[in-house]
């Protein structure tokens, strides 16, 4: 028995496409091996019409690929424009025809509707154009043209070479008389719309010797593309609407009751609140394509989603558009994280953030979802050494804990990093999440001195009070660089004195600099974490200055400065352009992304924002 | 969801024929797979044939056992689908179920614990 799988019996009709797919276990020799389609002969042959390896018969040349899935272990053969001719036994199958590693289909096609003697048929995608081609004989070169549609029994006038356009039509309709050389004139039809569906007639002249020629004009609701997510993760709908339409509105829209599509974003601004944080837009090529992307599914996320051009910026009659049906899986292998974090100003928040653990090489970026426009999100940190120059001293990604989580690390918060942050790596694209930060009223748990000022060749020491909530947690002092913070040795001094109602489990832990050189100038951190779970964090930036007298520096916190709201770096520090997410095929289609700092960076991530789960900001 | 509701099981003889009746309600069932699949007690639902359509095309599967005696076929108007058996034998008593999911993957597999009808028993007897 093979252990090939696929439909047994296809039917459609004439001019139609059908997609077979066939299942085939995805061990790694069937993955690679030659997958093919073959009409089975009289004999018992089987001609192979086309392969995985690129042949292709003179019979589908131009109406048909096939394309394989390895690793869902399937393969779609795709054929346009049946015929009744296509109509017969056929395998599909891997390796060599003969070999019987292959699975039967009967496709069966029938003619399609009846049509009259000489009809030319039509078929066209809703809120396209059309162009109909109406030839005539020298003697009604002169003579009135005209189209005519069908309704019912009657013909019904829809457009002439006197100027008469049918009111249905206005705004939307042509008829071109070709120059004196091609007896031929033409009807185009934009924005075409259901209705526009039926038979036509053009007409050259009015007598009996006029010439009729018969239209039929098929309308095509785009058929949803089936579109299956999982839980928390992301989708991306690519979509296409053709280069006549690249100066006009974009939108994508979510079909409600009826015929009703709620724009969940368009290219004039408006966003549907229940999308805020989690969706960009993608800004158009030229020839009008755009993208769109949604984190963090939910259940309710579910539907069928429609996108299209039209100057509302919403679907109308007549607007082209693609569509999706879009399902969400519960079973989801993306893990819950929490959607909220909450920190405190001048505190800090540590964010845990999944990725597929089968890509644990991958590059990690953090970044920040701007609403502005049609959705941004410019990058602040990445895994291999950058951040941005607002954020130096204040941000870090570390890889800890691993397996399929990785950490980032945000301090000296102000109300200005309240917002929408999104997870991503340059990996799987279904894996982004979010998270939004939240500053709520507080104080921050660690205490730390202001700015510290180091003499050169001297000692320093700079407390950090931990308070007794923290008693089990394993406290660090670690110095700051783009890579992560590099853990330093550090005394504990004891309860500290700086809590009131504290016991004897606060902490005062000291990092002792000793003979300060140039290159301990920097940020340092204090921090509690609980293995490889990082908790909050303090920093302190240390100024190394010329000795002007000698002894030792230590610091305590009623000598500290206040921390400072905002930073101004060294000038020396390199200043990096602003790096915004703005492509999501950027990683989906594997384009390099060696150094995304010199591009504008394309990424898809994830929001968990179905989850009420909230993460405080001082401890896991 | 899907509301789906069986019927037509019942006594049959070796040889004989049965008509099953599957008719989904609660949305249009374009964009799914509709599957018949038939359970013995003490054993695990078994795929038996599934059907989809996309515009005028339709797409037809069936397991070995059901090739040649078994076919599935749909009303668009009714929204319902239907699984003619014919040569029945005793090996195919069972309780038969209706299932729909999604059209994305292979039709024998995934079908949601809450998109099933309740069952119709089918016995053929020798």
């Known amino acids: 028995k093979s252990p090939i799988f696929g439909p047994e019996e296809v039917n459609s009709v004439e001019g139609n496409s059908v997609s077979i797919t066939c299942y085939y276990p995805p061990t790694s020799v069937n993955r690679h091996t030659r997958k093919y389609w073959c009409r089975q002969g009289a004999r018992g042959g089987c001609i192979t019409l086309i392969s995985s390896e690129g042949y292709v018969s003179s019979k589908y040349a131009g109406r048909a690929n096939l394309t394989n899935f390895p690793e869902n272990g399937t393969f779609v053969v795709n054929i346009a424009q049946l015929s009744q001719d296509d109509s017969g036994r056929y395998k599909c199958g891997l390796g060599i025809n003969s070999r019987g590693l292959s699975f039967d289909v009967s496709l069966e096609v029938s003619q399609g509707p009846g049509l009259l003697n000489d009809t030319k048929v039509y078929t066209v995608d809703l809120g396209r154009t059309v162009t109909i081609n109406c030839p005539f004989k020298t003697e009604n070169a002169q003579k009135r043209k005209s189209l005519y549609k069908q309704i019912g029994l009657y013909p019904v006038l829809v457009i002439d070479s006197s100027g008469y356009v049918n009111p249905n039509y206005t705004g939307r309709i042509r008829l071109d008389i070709q120059g004196t050389g091609q007896l031929l004139f033409s009807v185009v039809i934009n924005q075409l719309r259901l209705s526009d569906a039926g038979q036509y007639l053009c007409q050259a002249g009015d007598d009996s010797n006029s010439n009729k020629k018969n239209a039929d004009l098929q309308v095509l609701k785009p058929e949803p593309e089936l579109v299956y997510e999982d839980l928390r993760g992301s989708v991306t709908f690519h979509c296409a609407l053709g280069p006549e339409v690249a100066n006009v509105a974009k939108f994508l829209c979510r079909q409600s009751s009826g015929e009703n599509c709620d724009v969940v974003v368009n290219t004039l601004g408006k966003r549907a609140p229940a999308f805020e944080g989690r969706i960009l837009l993608n800004p158009q090529d030229k020839d009008g394509s755009f993208s769109v992307v949604i984190t963090g599914l939910r259940k309710e996320d579910a539907g069928r989603y429609l996108c299209g051009a039209h100057s509302d910026g919403q679907l109308q009659e007549g607007s082209p558009i693609q569509a999706w049906q879009l399902f969400v899986n519960e079973e989801s292998t993306i893990p819950r994280s929490p959607t909220v974090v909450k920190g405190v100003a001048g505190g800090s928040v540590a964010v845990l953030c999944p990725y597929n653990r089968k890509e644990s090489k991958s590059i990690k970026y953090w970044c920040l979802w701007e609403g502005a426009q049609n959705g941004r999100c410019p990058l602040l940190v990445d895994s291999e050494g950058w951040v941005k120059a607002q954020y130096e001293g204040r941000l870090s990604l570390l890889e800890e804990p691993g397996n399929g989580t990785f950490t980032v690390i945000l301090n000296q918060l102000t109300s200005r990093d309240a917002g929408f942050y999104w997870c991503l790596t340059n990996g799987d694209t279904l894996w982004r999440t979010t998270v939004e930060i939240k500053i709520i009223e507080g104080e921050p748990n660690l205490k730390v001195p202001g700015n510290v000022t180091a003499v050169l060749g001297e000692t320093l020491k700079v407390p950090c009070h931990f308070p007794c909530k923290f008693s089990s947690y394993e406290k660090y002092w670690c110095k700051w660089n783009n890579t992560g913070c590099q853990a330093l040795p550090s005394q504990d001094e004891g309860p500290s004195k700086a809590f009131v109602n504290c016991d004897e489990n606060s902490r005062l832990v000291s990092l002792t600099l000793n003979l300060v050189t140039r290159a301990d100038e920097g940020w340092y951190w204090c921090g509690v974490k609980q293995g490889h779970f990082y908790g909050e964090t303090a920093a302190v930036y240390v100024a190394v200055e010329e000795r002007k007298a000698a002894g030792s520096r230590d610091v305590s916190l009623a000598k500290a400065d206040a921390a400072p709201d905002e930073k101004v770096l060294d000038s020396g520090f390199r200043e990096i352009e602003n790096k915004a997410i703005q492509d999501p095929r950027l990683f989906a289609e594997e384009k390099a992304v060696a150094d995304t700092r010199d591009q504008a960076d394309g990424s898809r991530a994830s929001v968990d924002s179905g989850s009420s789960e909230e993460q405080g900001g001082s401890s896991r | 969801q899907v509301q789906l509701v069986e019927s037509g099981g019942g006594w049959v003889q070796t040889g004989g024929s049965l008509r099953l009746s599957c008719a989904a309600s609660g949305r249009t069932v374009s964009s799914y797979y509709m599957g018949w699949f038939r359970q013995t007690p003490g054993k695990e639902r078994e795929f038996v044939a599934a059907?989809?359509?996309?515009?005028?095309?339709?797409?037809?599967y069936y397991t070995d056992s059901a090739k040649g005696r078994f076919t599935i076929s749909r009303d668009n108007a009714k929204n319902t689908v239907y699984l003619q058996m014919n040569s029945l034998k005793p090996e195919d008593t069972a309780v038969y179920y209706c299932?729909?999911?999604?059209?994305?993957?292979?039709?024998?597999?995934?079908?949601?614990?809450?998109?099933w009808g309740q069952g119709t028993q089918v016995t053929v007897s020798s």
């Open positions: 059907i989809s359509w996309v515009g005028s095309s339709t797409y037809k």
């Open positions: 299932a729909a999911r999604p059209r994305v993957g292979d039709p024998r597999s995934r079908y949601d614990d809450d998109n």
